[in-house]
Amino acid sequence: LQDLCSNCPAGTFCDNNRSQICSPCPPNSFSSAGGQRTCDICRQCKGVFKTRKECSSTSNAECDCISGYHCLGAECSMCEQDCKQGQELTKKGCKDCCFGTFNDQKRGICRPWTNCSLDGKSVLVNGTKERDVVCGPSPADLSPGASSATPPAPAREPGHSPQ
């Protein structure tokens, strides 16, 4: 009996109620492998989802997110609202990154600026809401007598603009 079912190709299911004949998948369903005992439900891409690939008798539909949203989870199971760079999505919507944090993408959370001093370096370029700080040479490298091809930029604290 097992062998009869294994003969059923993708796009069909093995119908135990009908002496294990291979029946075509009903509308809005598919089977991507042979020998199936039932067909799987075609995914619907609606609302914030849009269809990237239609369902066929042998493969599921594939969804993307509409403009202004991005995919999350396995097989784009959820769509999350985009924010601007320099923002993060909270329960109350998109909010600007707090001072000392940044987000350079339309998704994800604001992350703290790199602490240059932990690596013994100084801040070369200030951080913003959209960009991390850029760390430069260590303060020791900037001391008089240290060899440097170009004069070093003045060290600044993160977030403080040059006067």
Epitope: C25, R37, K46
Partner: antibody, heavy 115, light 107 residues
């Protein structure tokens, strides 16, 4: 005939992890979508999530921080883990394969969360 | 999430009577709806898929209808073995959601 059988502890203490196994016969979990659902006292059902033929998982957002569904294709089994359980997680847990035209259910296993 | 409102929550009916149970979705679900029957101590059994298609082996006295947001399950002539709890389930959108159930008992 496709059969699904749930197994695991019937009593779990609050704050601990609930772990259940679904053993599948008559079908291969390398095809299709394999789900967990639960039915609370009072007959309310909740869909918990799935693991797919490709090993990708979907979780109900209401459980997302606590749930994990995994599988072992060599044993043709898939698993539910629910962390930090409370008495509200007391329910009969069912593994299922939703399908068209047939949907297959396990017989269900009652899990009580109690100190 | 799509909310499925099922009614009535319980009912008594006589043998031979026509019985109708309804499910209303909070949005259009494109007929992506199952009806299940659950008897005491048993796991649910599928009666109807895609709102109106009878599963092979299910008695023809069961039928499903509806579209958009409104769906119903009808038993044309109630038999004793039909008592149990009936549930609708939408599979149009994740997470799938169930109706609250209708407990059907014999008068």
């Amino acid at each position: 005939e496709v059969q699904l059988q749930e197994s695991g502890p019937s009593l779990v203490k609050p704050s601990q992890t609930l772990s259940l196994t679904c053993s599948v016969t008559g079908d291969s979990i390398t095809s299709g979508y394999w789900n967990w659902n639960r039915k609370f006292p009072g007959n309310k059902f909740e869909y918990m999530g799935y693991i797919s033929y490709s090993d990708s998982a979907y979780y109900n957002p209401s459980l997302k921080s606590r749930i994990s569904i995994t599988r072992d294709t060599s044993k043709n089994q898939y698993y539910l883990q629910l962390n930090s359980v409370t008495t509200e997680d007391t329910a009969t847990y069912y593994c299922t394969r939703w399908g068209i035209p047939f949907a297959f259910w396990g017989q269900g296993t009652l899990v009580t969360v109690s100190a | 999430d799509i909310k499925m409102t099922q009614s009535p929550s319980s009912m008594y009916a006589s043998l031979g009577e026509r019985v109708t149970i309804t499910c209303k979705a909070s949005q259009d679900i494109d007929s992506y709806l199952y009806w299940f029957q659950q008897k005491p101590g048993k796991s649910p059994e599928t009666l109807i898929y895609h709102a109106n298609r009878l599963v092979d082996g299910v008695p023809s006295r069961f039928s499903g209808s509806g579209s958009g947001q409104d769906y119903s399950l009808t038993i044309s002539s109630l038999e004793y073995e039909d008592m149990g709890i009936y549930y609708c389930l939408q599979y149009d959108e994740f997470p799938y959601t169930f109706g609250g159930g209708t407990k059907l008992e014999i008068k």
